[in-house]
């Protein structure tokens, strides 16, 4: 059978400061079991952008409803974009672990660039 793929269809997205940025991500399968998280950057210093289970992310909303059954769309929208939000965003699937979840597969990343707010 085909192994799960993490699809981030846009290599780059450009948004004007003050607007919202939609970062798209889709999975090709519901399994393996485990959460999906969004990060900015890669490696040990990456910044957690969204994790549904824990944390407070007031600027982030999910594109699909949190109550949608068997959802494969893990796109997010980030509001009130500023130049500090520029960077490459990764959608990452984790495999459920005990006690800790293990990174399973990452999307290719979407580079967010921020344009100056139109005058």
């Amino acid at each position: 059978e085909d192994e799960l793929q993490v699809i981030q269809p846009e290599k780059s997205v450009s948004v004007a400061a003050g607007e919202s940025a939609t970062l798209r991500c889709a999975m090709t399968s519901l399994i393996p079991v485990g959460p999906i998280m969004w990060f900015r950057g890669a490696g040990a210093g990456r910044e957690l952008i969204y994790n549904q289970k824990e944390g407070h992310f007031p600027r982030v909303t999910t594109v699909s409803e949190l109550t949608k059954r068997n959802n494969l769309d893990f796109s997010i929208s980030i509001s009130n974009i500023t130049p500090a939000d520029a960077g490459t965003y990764y959608c990452v699937k984790f495999r459920k672990g005990s006690p800790d979840d293990v990174e399973f597969k990452s999307g290719a990343g979407t580079e967010l660039s921020v344009r100056a707010k139109p005058s």
Partner: antibody
Framework: VQLVESGGGVVRPGESLRLSCAAS????????MTWVRQAPGEGLEWVST??????YYADSVKGRFTISRDNSKNTLYLQMNSLRAEDTAVYYC???????????????WGLGTLVTVSS | EIVLTQSPATLSVSPGERATFSCRAS??????LAWYQQRPGQAPRLLIY???IRETGIPERFSGSGSGTEFTLTITSLQSEDFAVYYC??????????FGGGTKVEIK
């Protein structure tokens, strides 16, 4: 959706048994699957879950039970070794369902198969 | 492990009346809670998921509410087929998935 368990029966302590669950009516390979058991007159107890090779077990069965699946046959298995009297229960096969970014619950259940462990 | 405590263990209700029973979690499970009905001699049946969403085909007289650690299942105007055992299940933190001990709804 239909789930049909088989393989239950009467065995002595220390013996083995293999349960099967034949699934139909959905794309079996896309979903995690679970075994839940119910001792006579008691409540429900989660036993084991399998995703796509990722497996999870209750502490009470870890090291004795093995969950597996054959996606080409749309069949879920539970190999039960070193059986104990306290394993006596009706064993239900269940299909996992997820809510968006969250965990799993069980939207379809088989009718169950009775396993009796007695000397 | 998250422990789910259901109360009461048994609820005696007359047909046509309302039944309300609770499920308390030992720690916050957000909305990651499901309710199941099990009639005598039958397999469990999913009623509610995400604490409040009715499964397809479940009558409107069943409703779930609550979040965090306190949850309630309400059945308005009990029908004869509603006399059964009801279990809650959390899927916020696992393994293990955990179930409550059940509430038996019997005819008064």
């Amino acid at each position: 959706v239909q789930l049909v368990e088989s393989g239950g029966g009467v065995v002595r302590p220390g013996e083995s048994l293999r349960l099967s669950c034949a699934a139909s009516g959905f794309r079996f390979s896309n979903f995690a699957m679970t075994w839940v058991r119910q001792a006579p007159g008691e409540g429900l107890e989660w036993v084991s879950t399998i995703g796509s090779g990722d497996t999870y077990y209750a502490d009470s069965v870890k090291g004795r039970f093995t969950i597996s699946r054959d996606n080409s046959k749309n069949t879920l298995y539970l190999q039960m070794n070193s059986l104990r009297a306290e394993d006596t229960a009706v064993y239900y096969c269940a299909k996992d369902s997820t809510v968006s970014w969250s965990g799993d619950f069980f939207d379809y259940w088989g009718l169950g198969t009775l396993v009796t462990v007695s000397s | 492990e998250i422990v789910l405590t259901q109360s009461p263990a048994t609820l005696s209700v007359s047909p046509g009346e309302r039944a309300t029973f609770s499920c308390r979690a030992s720690q916050n499970v957000k909305n990651d809670l499901a309710w199941y009905q099990q009639r005598p001699g039958q397999a469990p049946r999913l009623l509610i998921y995400a604490a409040r969403i009715r499964e397809t085909g479940i009558p409107e007289r069943f409703s779930g509410s609550g979040s965090g650690t306190e949850f309630t299942l309400t059945i308005t105007s009990l029908q004869s087929e509603d006399f059964a055992v009801y279990y809650c299940q959390q899927y916020y933190d696992w393994p293990p998935f955990t179930f409550g001990g059940g509430t038996k709804v019997e005819i008064k």
